[in-house]
């Protein structure tokens, strides 16, 4: 519960925070758990404790292990654990999963990528940023304070972003790199006045008496998740449920999201055992959302059965 995972690369600076919090005046003692050996506070040591922080300047693979911090408060001691792993530098460009910080998402309107853990270090701007190991260049990329801003984000901007900065401790400089994935969310959805794709306005649908018939009402309402959108059928201006004809039922079709991102709905009207009187009814396909209502009317006409006799 009171443990936190930290990782870094050999020959880089790594600063780790004690998972237990307290007041600035509380004493914090650090120990290497495996040996129970106290971590020195003198800054001349490569690994030293500085209050809530444990500093590896620079880190070595052999530093890996569990470190115990004890925050000494007036009434009780709060113990926390920092699980530290130092990895060898990869010769290739690929950043393994175990070196990745949490993934962040961006969209056209918000494309900030924060440099992970940077608040622990004494650094000065500017940050250097890399995507898939390539230095980022061009006016679309702006390093601002501790984050990267990407203008006009596109899906191709998804990938692994590495920030690189210099930590300064008593005049000595140490390099730090941190990598996280960036994913691009679809742009914010929008809502339009309903557009009915089928049936066409005043369409005549041919049906065979005695057979079953299906009519599909299909409409699109905009892009992305829609707050309120519905498609339905009416018979002579009356809801299907109120019309009282058990042979005629409506059934929700597939919610569709086309490749162009449009959010569309289908409603299928099923007429069992078509009768003559069904030809006299007016069938209305209704599509409605917050913008309003659109109606397309269909009528049925008799289709003569194909004569198979010679």
């Amino acid at each position: 519960k009171f443990s936190k995972q930290s990782w870094g690369l050999e020959n880089e600076a790594l600063i780790v925070r004690c998972p237990r919090q307290g007041k600035p005046s509380y004493t914090v003692d650090w120990y290497y758990s495996q040996t129970n050996k106290s971590i020195p506070t003198q800054e001349r040591n490569r690994v030293f404790a500085s209050g809530q922080l444990l500093k590896f300047l620079p880190a070595a693979v052999a530093d890996s292990g569990i470190y115990t911090c004890i925050v000494r408060s007036p009434t009780f001691n709060r113990t926390g654990y920092a699980n530290v792993t130092i990895y060898k530098k990869q010769s290739d460009c690929n950043v393994p999963d175990y070196l990745m910080y949490s993934t962040v998402s961006g969209s056209e309107k918000n494309s900030k990528i924060y440099c992970p853990t940077i608040d622990l270090y004494n650094w000065t701007a500017p940050l250097e940023w890399f995507k898939n190991c390539q230095a980022l260049q061009g006016s679309r990329y702006r390093a601002h304070k501790s984050f990267l801003v990407i203008d006009n984000v596109m899906t191709e901007d998804a990938g692994d972003y590495t920030c690189k900065f210099i930590h300064n401790e008593n005049g000595a400089n140490y390099s730090v790199t941190a990598t996280r994935s960036f994913t691009v969310k679809d742009e914010q959805g929008f809502s339009l006045f309903p557009v009915i794709g089928a049936p066409a306005q005043n369409e005549i649908k041919e049906v065979e008496i005695g057979k079953n018939a299906n009519l599909t009402c299909s409409a699109c309402f905009g892009k992305g998740t829609q707050f309120l959108a519905a498609v339905l059928w009416q018979l002579n201006g009356t809801k299907i449920t109120d019309f009282g004809e058990p042979r005629i039922q409506q059934e929700e079709g597939q919610n569709q999201s086309f490749s162009n991102g449009l959010a569309c709905l289908d409603m299928v009207l099923r007429i069992a055992d078509v009768k003559e009187e069904d030809l006299l009814l007016q069938y209305d396909c209704l599509a409605l959302n917050l913008h309003g209502l659109r109606r397309h009317t269909v009528r049925l006409s008799r289709k003569n059965p194909i004569d198979h006799h010679s």
Partner: antibody, heavy 116, light 113 residues
Framework: QVQLVQSGAEVKKPGASVKVSCKAS????????MNWVRQAPGQRLEWMGW????????TYGDNFKGRVTITRDTSASTAYMELSSLRSEDTAVYYC?????????WGQGTLVTVSS | DIQMTQSPSSLSASVGDRVTITCKSS????????????LAWYQQKPGKVPKLLIY???TRESGVPSRFSGSGSGTDFTLTISSLQPEDLATYYC?????????FGGGTKVEIK
């Protein structure tokens, strides 16, 4: 500069729950714990609990145990206090206050009124 | 729980007066580990948010006028306003900043004569 901005006033019925948010800015959120303090009209300040914002571990005052839940969202630099089974005596101004030597930084307060 | 008892509960004084508010805790607020007294003083003006004046029993928060001072150790503490000003009209609270649950005194309401 350090700022703590709380959510707006709430009116609740007895038995309901209320959730108050506290958005921090101007400092690194996970470096400091966050306390919640309330003040009923004309009464003294009353500490409700605090949360370790780094690991999400809350500590509650005995008077509120079982009714209060303090959480945080580090990505939004926001702490939350939820109080359930509200009664009329929970009518108060609720404050978030950053941990430190004393509470140097406070939210503006959120008035919660419990009335049938 | 540590009980915090403030006195007086209210007082009225003239501009320029020296004002003293006392606070007693039911247990010592001195931490032997660093010799700090974990006691804080706050000022709360009507309808406003509490403002930290003093922490560690005697350390003035930055920006707080020098007329405010804190003293005491263990269980007995004092807040002194050396020369009362009209803007000091407020309720003053002491707080146990030593152990959970953090507790506050009942407050001292300071009025200007």
């Amino acid at each position: 500069q350090v700022q703590l901005v709380q959510s707006g006033a709430e009116v609740k019925k007895p038995g309901a729950s209320v959730k108050v948010s506290c958005k921090a800015s101007g400092y690194t959120f996970i470096n400091y714990g966050m306390n919640w303090v309330r003040q009923a009209p004309g009464q003294r300040l009353e500490w409700m609990g605090w949360i370790n914002t780094y690991i999400g571990e809350p500590t509650y005052g005995d008077n509120f145990k079982g009714r209060v839940t303090i959480t945080r969202d580090t990505s939004a630099s926001t702490a939350y206090m939820e109080l359930s089974s509200l009664r009329s005596e929970d009518t108060a101004v609720y404050y978030c206050a950053r941990e430190g030597e004393g509470f140097a930084y406070w939210g503006q307060g959120t008035l919660v009124t419990v009335s049938s | 729980d540590i009980q915090m008892t403030q006195s007086p509960s209210s007082l009225s004084a003239s501009v320029g007066d020296r004002v003293t508010i006392t606070c007693k805790s039911s247990q010592s607020l001195l931490y032997s580990g660093n010799q700090n007294n974990y006691l804080a003083w706050y000022q709360q003006k009507p309808g406003k948010v509490p403002k930290l004046l003093i922490y560690g029993a005697s350390t003035r928060e930055s920006g707080v006028p020098s007329r405010f001072s804190g003293s005491g150790s263990g269980t007995d503490f004092t807040l002194t306003i050396s020369s009362l000003q009209p803007e000091d009209l407020a309720t003053y609270y002491c707080q146990n900043d030593h152990s959970y649950p953090y507790t506050f005194g009942g407050g001292t309401k300071v009025e200007i004569k």
